[in-house]
């Protein structure tokens, strides 16, 4: 058993049929010694008396809010949550496996630049009695500070018969060094509590591996005289790290016909313009990627050819 | 060329070669997600590699003030990786084909380090840990770790030379 926060405790249980469970001793936070009784949740049934209460925690029915009273007055509470371990593996019932970039990916994180600011998100099908708390650091043995906000519900989607809820959190490294080569990964830890079930999820990454620039901005076409060619120009996104002579991007320009089956013409360039042939009903799209490190491409910025 | 005394390197040549290094490093190990190398028990090699750290002067302001600290750090790293890529970690099983980018990568590391430090001048270099893993899986794991680490190192070096070529070239 360990303390998650004040008056909230997590009991770690090996979860299998007829498991013996864990013996837990609760102590009433009071100077009183006599006349103390214990109850669980809203029940008025007295579970025991005395300053301490010993219970055998085996299942969710044994978890909940234990309260000690004296003469009708509440003295203190202890909330017990369960953390299940099945076949040596901690349960992951609360969050959905996003399966990208690999199986058992519950948390996904992205950064728009090298400033040390990043966003993580996760999915669940649970709509109520759900709380999250997020902590982060750079490195684990001698951790350097990363400050995370509160997790918020950022999107709701309908998937078949199920509703899916996306939560996200923003974090910022306290003393970020955008130009340095990271040697210690960022660690993100999410505590999830659904009713009386506790789970924790972690992710470990370098900012450089989660970079995904915003799409290029101000995408414009300039027709070239007496030609089917156009000059496409664009600019670096505002959110990208500066100076651009140091934090450079590379770009992919694509001409795509109306039908998905039509052949796509692609050009790669380090410049912020390119000359392409504009076909009728086609559209021109441009996306960006870090020039020197192959992290994710941005989403496409697009304009119609006409 | 950068000499310990402090003249400027051939920024544009260094820029071109460092960008080529980035491409080669990603050709040699293009996979990001196929195995989480940090879960696989950290070998000493990748802990001991020279990283370009915050105080090394490789940020735009540091380069403007005095690029020598940064160039020395980059040179140290190039020599370190060049020795690693030439070691028996990259020979033996699993077999690398003769078209492997590792050969070109090795040569380009040497080429860039020579651009930064012509013969006759000597910056301190870092000892490479002596590692000769006997099992193919240990060797492959080390290769992947070294290449992932090299990708990060050459990315910073390429930014330095690109910025230098754009703002510090005579």
């Amino acid at each position: 058993i360990w303390e998650l926060k004040k008056d909230v405790y997590v009991v770690e249980l090996d979860w299998y049929p007829d498991a013996p469970g864990e013996m837990v001793v609760l102590t009433c936070d009071t100077p009183e010694e006599d006349g103390i009784t214990w109850t669980l949740d809203q029940s008025s049934e007295v579970l025991g008396s005395g300053k301490t209460l010993t219970i055998q925690v085996k299942e969710f029915g044994d978890a909940g809010q234990y309260t000690c009273h004296k003469g009708g007055e509440v003295l203190s509470h202890s909330l017990l949550l369960l953390h299940k371990k099945e076949d040596g593996i901690w349960s992951t019932d609360i969050l959905k496996d996003q399966k990208e970039p690999k199986n058992k990916t519950f948390l996904r994180c992205e950064a728009k630049n090298y400033s040390g600011r990043f966003t993580c998100w996760w999915l669940t099908t649970i709509s109520t009695d759900l709380t999250f708390s997020v902590k982060s650091s750079r490195g684990s043995s001698d951790p350097q500070g990363v400050t995370c906000g509160a997790a918020t519900l950022s999107a709701e989607r309908v998937r078949g018969d199920n509703k899916e809820y996306e939560y996200s959190v923003e974090c910022q490294e306290d003393s970020a060094c955008p130009a340095a080569e990271e040697s210690l990964p960022i660690e993100v830890m999410v505590d999830a509590v659904h009713k009386l079930k506790y789970e924790n999820y972690t992710s470990s990454f370098f900012i450089r591996d989660i970079i995904k620039p915003d799409p290029p901005k101000n995408l414009q076409l300039k027709p070239l005289k007496n030609s089917r060619q156009v000059e496409v120009s664009w600019e670096y996104p505002d959110t990208w790290s500066t100076p651009h002579s140091y934090f450079s991007l590379t770009f992919c320009v694509q001409v795509q016909g109306k039908s998905k089956r039509e052949k796509k013409d692609r050009v790669f360039t380090d410049k912020t313009s390119a000359t392409v042939i504009c076909r009728k009903n086609a559209s021109i799209s441009v996306r960006a990627q870090d020039r020197y490190y192959s992290s994710s491409w941005s989403e496409w910025a697009s304009v119609p050819c006409s | 060329r950068a000499v310990p005394g402090g003249s400027s390197p051939a920024w544009t040549q260094c820029q071109q070669l460092s960008q080529k290094l980035c491409t080669l490093a990603w050709s040699a190990h293009p996979l990001v997600g196929h195995m989480d190398l940090r879960e696989e028990g950290d070998e000493e090699t990748t802990n001991d590699v020279p990283h370009i750290q915050c105080g090394d002067g490789c940020d735009p302001q540091g380069l403007r003030d005095n690029s020598q600290f940064c160039l020395q750090r980059i040179h140290q790293g190039l020599i370190f990786y060049e020795k690693l890529l030439g070691s028996d970690i990259f020979t033996g099983e699993p077999s690398l084909l003769p078209d492997s980018p590792v050969g070109q990568l090795h040569a380009s590391l040497l080429g860039l380090s020579q651009l930064l430090q012509p013969e006759g001048h000597h910056w301190e270099t870092q000892q490479i840990p002596s590692l000769s893993p006997s099992q193919p899986w240990q060797r492959l794991l080390l290769r992947f770790k070294i290449l992932r680490s090299l990708q990060a190192f050459v990315a910073v070096a390429a930014r330095v030379f690109a910025h230098g070529a754009a703002t510090l070239s005579p």
């Epitope: - | 050709s27 040699a28 190990h29 293009p30 996979l31 196929h34 195995m35 099983e93 699993p94 077999s95 690398l96 084909l97 003769p98 078209d99 492997s100 980018p101 590792v102 099992q135 193919p136 899986w137 060797r139 492959l140 794991l141």
Partner: antibody
Framework: QVQLVQSGAEVKKPGSSVKVSCKAS????????IHWMRQAPGQGLEWIGY????????KYNENFKGKVTITADKSTSTAYMELSSLRSEDTAVYYC?????????????WGQGTLVTVSS | DIQMTQSPSSLSASVGDRVTITCKAS??????VAWYQQKPGKVPKLLIY???TRHTGVPSRFSGSGSRTDFTLTISSLQPEDVADYFC?????????FGSGTKLEIK
């Protein structure tokens, strides 16, 4: 895009030779090794060897040494595999293939295969 | 030479079934193992390399696992178009060698 086009099916007499070609396009021919495999009817695959066109250096599976000669013609971006002293057990589909660019031999692109039948 | 012992040599399963094919290397090949699919009369097609990395465009129902000597190809939910021969292949050591193949049919 990368393409490997092999020569057509051949019927040969025991003791004779056959030369199968593999014309490559869509990439720089001298940049990558070209490998040859064979698959006897209803059987698995066997790796025969490769040629690295940049320096014309072949490498063979010991089991095929003396039986096979692999060459390359840079001017036409074509690799060749010649089988000599043919016997009935050489009847198989022969494939050329090129691996991933990272320098390890998992084969991404394959020729369409050439059936060589050895029969008297 | 490294032997790649593949099993079973043939198997019949129903659409939607989970199918597992195994390959055992006669010595350590790290994760230098690929899996190929070959449909009747067609060319082998790369499915998995580095033991577990799906090649571009390969459906997510195909997955690979294993390291050193024991490797597995899994099809999580068999589809009619998965009828084919499947081969494992080690590219750790010369000469590169292949498993003898598994013929997969639909019940």
């Amino acid at each position: 895009q990368v393409q490997l086009v092999q020569s057509g099916a051949e019927v040969k007499k025991p003791g004779s030779s056959v030369k199968v070609s593999c014309k490559a396009s869509g990439y720089t021919f001298t940049d990558q090794t070209i490998h040859w495999m064979r698959q006897a009817p209803g059987q698995g695959l066997e790796w025969i060897g490769y040629i690295y066109p940049r320096d014309d250096s072949p490498k063979y599976n010991e089991n095929f040494k003396g039986k096979v000669t692999i060459t390359a013609d840079k001017s036409t971006s074509t690799a060749y595999m010649e089988l000599s002293s043919l016997r009935s057990e050489d009847t198989a589909v022969y494939y050329c293939a090129i691996p991933d660019r990272s320098g390890y031999a998992h084969f991404i692109y394959w020729g369409q295969g050439t059936l060589v039948t050895v029969s008297s | 030479d490294i032997q790649m012992t593949q099993s079973p040599s043939s198997l019949s399963a129903s659409v939607g079934d989970r199918v597992t094919i195994t390959c055992k290397a006669s010595r350590d090949v790290a994760i230098a193992v690929a899996w190929y699919q070959q449909k009747p009369g067609k060319v082998p097609k790369l499915l998995i390399y580095w033991a577990s990395t799906r090649h571009t465009g390969v459906p997510s129902r195909f997955s690979g696992s294993g390291s050193r000597t024991d490797f597995t190809l899994t099809i999580s939910s068999l589809q009619p178009e998965d009828v084919a021969d499947y081969f494992c292949h080690q590219y750790s050591s010369y000469p590169f060698t292949f498993g003898s193949g598994t013929k997969l049919e639909i019940k």
